[in-house]
């Protein structure tokens, strides 16, 4: 049952080895003067720590009962380099009638299975056969840092040595690093760099645009309070320990400043009474944009040149002005803000609302019936439109017909040139209302007042015009 | 990184006491941490340690004389059952490792006086 | 438990000379064996640990050697500030044997 045997026989000292009196054997190369490190426990939370000794139920031929069977000493406490080799060992005389024996490894409570280099070996003797039990790694690491424990399983009972305590160390590992920050001009802020051995103590210094800042060294964790910038500066920290010096990232500490102006304001959509326009966001100044204003000024010589402001959120970068005139020039610029002011205006724009439909009705509505009785006869003055309202290019007629309950609307289209239409008589004994909206390219102004005329039955005639009065007439 | 003990005062025989430790600038998580004492002129009484996972070892003589606790900053000492010879300055220090139980930083103490 | 006993108990030596302070374990305790220095009203502070590793800062004027259950400390070229009680401690395998210190050993030094 032998896996490997270098040497002749247990228990004496292996060749190459180091052993203390009856501990257990250890093979270290590069290890003196190495100092403290990381480590952590050799039991699983809540499991019990089972004890070394285990006292065998069985009897030898001879009925004398057998000495407890326990892990010798162990070496203790390794301390070694990164990226050094190590070998430690675990040994154990047990009686030859036990047969089946493993060792496993341990390392803060969880089995080492896998891809680790474990040899046992086993010495047999007349009564006692010496196992011992190698662990080695090669190029440790910080992760290696570790209570490791051998573990017997024999005959029911589990067997635990004492834990060697694995101490790697090395150059400090930074567990916090500065962090690149946004401060405000002359406002103190704080910086936080921690590091960790082994070897501890760590010492953290502080360095600013490449010059120290702390002539004396601070024990990590270290904060810096920089009293305040008026200028962009990069700050790293040094952490040393016994072993050398480790430097952080350098991180850029920038001055928050008003942002720079939007850029490429454009036009997307046009109406009479609205523009939708969007911009590219300038530099935020190292804050995040709050809010942007969209200033508006008409173009027009004959405005007063007031500028409406109109503030809308700084996403999406795009609002839609609204309650513009018709038929008008704008300029638009747009400037955003953040915690420290507002930018300058983005370069201003030239834009135009498009016509809009006429706001006034049609003047002097009169409707007759002509004589033949077929026709009925519209007549209308045309609307004092404004020039925001754009050419008219047309009117529409409304007439509502009613007789016995029965309602029936009709719409026609005339030219701008008219300002009179007929329409066909469509029902006898009925109720003719008549209203008419001014039309432009920007849409269909409002309706006239209705305008009721009833048409009789056929054999009856009535000439007798109805009429809404123009304004200022009684 | 450091340890400070408080809690530390004068008690009645039988009176249970709790003496906190506050760690600062390290992980209980990481280094476990034991609890000496050392009564006036005399020399360093080891009472028990705390690992990083939270098991809990005593001295023989210390065990159900004393219960170490912890919390993510702090490691409590409880003194079931105070006698006049508990009177001591009582230390918590950092072990080197999880499960190591030398100690590399030291608090400076807290004076417990159990006196009728 | 392991226990330590740790020789002299006093020790008397001269400015510039060489103390020896031992211990000794009750069993094997391999090398997992730490020595601190006590001032009076002060902290103990660790020197040494796993039997011959300094610890930072410490100078190199202390030494510690010896494994198993026989250890010493050596302190050469002494000092008037080495005047302090020194203790050796136990922290092997201290889930099973504890972490006993040893009774301390006084240095005075002329």
């Known amino acids: 049952r032998e896996e490997a045997k270098p040497y002749p026989l247990f228990p004496g000292p292996l060749p190459g080895s180091l052993q203390t009196d009856h501990t257990s054997l250890l093979s270290l190369p590069h290890t003196s003067g190495y100092q403290p490190a990381l480590m952590f426990s050799p039991t699983q939370p809540g499991r019990p720590y089972t004890g070394n000794v285990a006292i065998p139920r069985v009897t030898s031929a001879g009925s004398k009962l057998l000495p407890p069977l326990a892990f010798k000493h162990t070496v203790g406490h390794i301390i070694l380099s990164e990226h050094k080799d190590v070998k430690f060992n675990c040994s154990i005389s047990v009686p030859n009638i036990y047969q089946d024996t493993t060792i496993s490894w341990w390392k803060d409570g969880k089995e080492l299975l896998g891809a680790h280099h474990a040899i046992t070996q086993f010495y047999p003797d007349d009564e006692v056969t010496a196992i011992i039990a190698s662990f080695s790694i090669t190029s440790v690491q910080r992760s290696d840092n570790g209570s490791y424990i051998c573990k017997m399983k024999i005959n029911n009972e589990e067997i635990v040595s004492d834990p060697i305590y694995i101490e790697v160390q090395g150059l400090p590992h930074f567990t916090k690093q500065p962090e690149s920050m946004n401060v405000t001009r002359n406002t103190a802020f704080n910086l936080t760099c921690q590091a960790v051995g082994p070897p501890e103590p760590v010492n953290i210094f502080w360095v600013q645009n490449s010059s120290r800042v702390n002539e004396q060294p601070e024990k990590s964790p270290s904060v810096l309070t920089v009293p305040g910038l008026t200028e962009m500066a990069v700050f790293s920290c040094e952490a040393h320990n016994d072993k050398g010096l480790t430097v952080s990232k350098g991180v850029q500490i920038n001055i928050k400043a008003i942002p720079s102006p939007p850029t490429e304001v454009s036009i997307h959509n046009s109406t009479a009474h609205s523009i939708l326009i969007s911009w590219v966001p300038g530099f935020d100044g190292y804050s995040p944009f709050r809010n942007c204003s969209v200033q508006v000024k008409e173009v027009d010589p004959l405005s007063n040149g007031s500028v409406m402001i109109f503030n809308t959120s700084a996403s999406p970068h795009m609002y839609q002005i609204k309650q513009l005139q018709a038929l008008a020039n704008y300029s638009i610029g747009v400037s955003c803000m953040n915690e420290i002011g507002w930018s300058a205006v983005s370069p201003w724009i030239l834009a135009s609302t498009t016509e809009g439909a006429p706001s006034v009705a049609p003047l002097n509505v009169t409707v007759f019936l002509n004589e033949s009785r077929d026709n009925v006869d519209i007549r209308w003055m045309k609307p004092l439109t404004k020039r925001q309202a754009g050419e008219l290019v047309g009117y529409r007629i409304s007439h509502v017909w009613q007789s016995a309950g029965i309602s029936k609307e009709l719409l026609e289209e005339v030219g701008q040139n008219n300002s009179r239409a007929q329409i066909s008589v469509q029902v006898h004994n009925a109720t003719c209302t008549v209203r008419i909206a001014a039309v432009t390219k920007g849409g269909v102004g409002p309706f006239s007042d209705p305008v009721k005329i009833f048409i009789p039955a056929h054999g009856w005639v009535d000439h007798a015009p109805s009429s809404t009065p123009a304004p200022g007439n009684a | 990184q450091s340890v400070e003990e408080s809690g530390g005062r004068l008690v009645t025989p039988g009176t249970p006491l709790t003496v906190t430790c506050t760690v600062s600038?390290?992980?209980?998580?990481?280094?476990?941490m034991g609890w000496v004492r050392q009564a006036p002129g005399k020399g360093l009484e080891y009472i028990g340690f705390i690992n990083n996972v939270g098991n809990t070892y005593y001295a023989s003589w210390a065990k159900g004389r004393f219960t170490i606790s912890k919390t993510s900053t702090t490691v409590d000492l409880k003194i079931t059952s105070p006698t006049t010879e508990d009177t001591a300055t009582y230390f918590c220090?950092?072990?080197?490792?999880?499960?190591?139980?030398?100690?590399?930083?030291w608090g400076p103490g807290t004076l417990v006086t159990v006196s009728l | 438990d392991v226990v330590m006993t740790q020789t002299p108990a006093s020790v008397e030596a001269a400015v510039g000379g060489t103390v020896t302070i031992k211990c000794q374990a009750s069993q094997s305790i391999g090398n997992a064996l730490a020595w601190y220095q006590q001032k009076p009203g002060q902290r103990p502070k660790l020197l040494i640990y796993a039997a011959s590793n300094l610890a930072s800062g410490v100078p190199s004027r202390f030494a510690g050697s010896g494994s198993g259950t026989q250890f010493t400390l050596t302190i050469s070229d002494l000092e008037c500030a080495d005047a302090a009680t020194y203790y050796c401690q136990t922290y092997y395998a201290i889930n099973r044997y504890g972490g006993a210190f040893g009774g301390g050993t006084e240095v005075v030094v002329k």
């Open positions: 220090a950092k072990g080197g490792g999880g499960d190591w139980g030398y100690f590399n930083i």
């Open positions: 600038g390290f992980s209980l998580s990481v280094y476990g």
